[in-house]
């Protein structure tokens, strides 16, 4: 049921597609051989207990994602594609949704962003994503209405709150992340904020409070205090390596 | 800096309408999804309606649906409340509020009394 | 439908600590680790104090901070002034009727 599900992402999730839509049945699961590597941004992720999120196109994948076929010969998982850690700058990318936060790819290369390399007024396809029609939905009802749609982006750095639809459209320091409505530029977590540990089990919920990621030499770990509290509600916060 | 300016609030009687408005100004207000949000004398604060940047989608409180409706004008920078078939239970200081991440900025409001 | 329980007072004296909790279900605060906090003073506007459970937004004195454990969320205040007395309000959201929810309010009374 809606009630029960888990609603809050540091990876960044967008809702899952109606059923039938381009991504499939939502929580499919994809099955991939434990042990195998896959090269994210900013460390090698074994998928021994992580289970893939799989993805049509990359705005279904976190910001420091993107979506994918894993090129690392890993048995049983066929033509699907899956979303696979963001690559750091310098690392080998072929789009600019391959780059992590901050960077884009250029000459195959992931570059730190100076914003420069956007055309202005340049034409984007777009996915808008909706929660619900003109009125409330009715309950149950709360995978978005996803329509492509045209739009001329000029690139002026969205500021905290402000909608988005991908991280590149906020200002330096902020990602973009559902915030229950919309998705929307919050900032890139600091030391001791609350954070989500994404474990990608059992099936995958509609993720409704979505979180950046933890800053620059920070980490999403469980909070020291939080032991007593149950599994479900234990609390991750951002802390030092 | 950001500014919110309730206005339209007043005197009506059960069953009539009163339109609210809300000026916006120091933010690029058609960036962000805009909220209204009442309080009813001495009591607490109470979500009323909700409308994205753009205007295509909006929500609104079980207490309101069907009676209240919220619009925006991009170009004019300002939040629009509908409000018919008012009930004395409307009676409140109806807030205009930025939701950017929650909301983060609000009006001074603007009191809104249901009698006969 | 949510229902998010505040305690109707609490009180404290100058430099005290105190905490108002808000309590909540294992289907909303406890499932979903989200909750805000507003401070409203008599005849004013609300105010964002405290988003997801611990930020504090720019202009917020580190006084005031957020946590949670399992369906109750509680705001902290240290170091009480005079002009913390004020009514304050937690917040989350209704994923069933897409709709954002406030608790009933809490009177901070400072002594003295």
């Known amino acids: 049921t809606l009630n029960s599900v888990l609603i809050n992402s540091n990876a960044i999730k967008n809702l899952p597609p109606p059923l039938g839509g381009a991504g499939g049945q939502p929580g499919s699961a994809v099955s991939v051989a434990p042990g195998v590597l896959y090269e994210g941004g900013n460390k090698y992720q074994t998928l021994d207990n992580y289970q893939p999120y799989p993805c049509a196109e990359d705005e279904e994948c976190g910001s420091d994602e993107y979506c994918s076929s894993p090129s690392r010969g890993a048995a049983g998982v066929g033509g699907v594609q899956i979303c696979l850690a963001c690559r750091k700058r310098r690392k080998r990318c072929m789009r600019h949704a391959m780059c992590c936060p901050g960077n884009y790819c250029k000459n195959g290369i992931c570059m730190p962003s100076d914003h420069s390399h956007f055309p202005r007024g340049e034409i984007e396809e777009s996915i808008i994503e909706n929660l619900g029609n003109d009125h409330n939905a009715a309950a149950g009802d709360g995978y978005p209405r996803r329509t492509t749609l045209t739009s001329k982006i000029y690139h002026t750095k969205g500021q905290e709150g402000s909608v988005c639809l991908r991280s590149s459209d906020c200002a330096a320091g902020l990602c973009c992340a559902r915030h229950f409505w919309s998705k929307i530029c919050k900032p890139v977590l600091k030391e001791g904020q609350v954070c989500t540990k994404h474990k990608r089990k059992g099936s995958h919920g509609l993720e409704i409070f979505q979180r950046c990621y933890c800053g620059e030499g920070l980490a999403c770990r469980i909070q020291k205090d939080h032991h007593q509290a149950s599994n479900s509600s234990r609390l991750h916060t951002c802390q030092r390596h | 800096q950001v500014q919110l300016v309730e206005s339209g609030g007043g005197l009506v009687q059960p069953g009539g309408s009163l339109r609210l408005s809300c000026a916006a100004s120091g933010f690029t207000f058609s960036s962000y999804w805009m909220s209204w949000v009442r309080q009813a004398p001495g009591k607490g604060l109470e979500w009323v309606s909700v409308?994205?940047?753009?205007?295509?989608?909006?929500y609104y409180a079980d207490s309101v649906k069907g009676r209240f409706t919220i619009s925006r004008d991009n170009s004019k920078n300002t939040l629009y409340l509908q409000m018919n078939s008012l009930r004395a239970e409307d009676t409140a200081v109806y807030y205009c509020?930025?939701?950017?991440?929650?909301?983060?900025?609000w009006g001074q409001g603007t009191l809104v009394t249901v009698s006969s | 439908d949510i229902a998010l329980t505040q305690p109707a007072s609490v009180s404290g004296s100058p430099g005290q600590s105190i905490t108002i909790s808000c309590t909540g279900t294992s289907s909303d605060l406890g499932g979903y680790n989200y909750v805000s906090w507003y401070q409203q003073h008599p005849g004013k506007a609300p105010k964002l104090m405290i988003y997801?459970?611990?930020n504090r937004p720019s202009g917020v004195s580190n006084r005031f901070s957020g946590s949670k454990s399992g369906n109750t969320a509680s705001l902290t205040i240290s170091g009480l002034q005079a002009e913390d007395e004020a009514d304050y309000y937690c917040q989350t959201y209704d994923q069933i009727k897409l709709s954002a929810v406030f608790g009933g309010g809490t009177k901070l009374t400072v002594l003295g």
């Open positions: 997801d459970v611990n």
């Open positions: 509020a930025r939701h950017g991440i929650d909301f983060d900025h």
């Open positions: 409308i994205s940047s753009d205007s295509s989608s909006t």
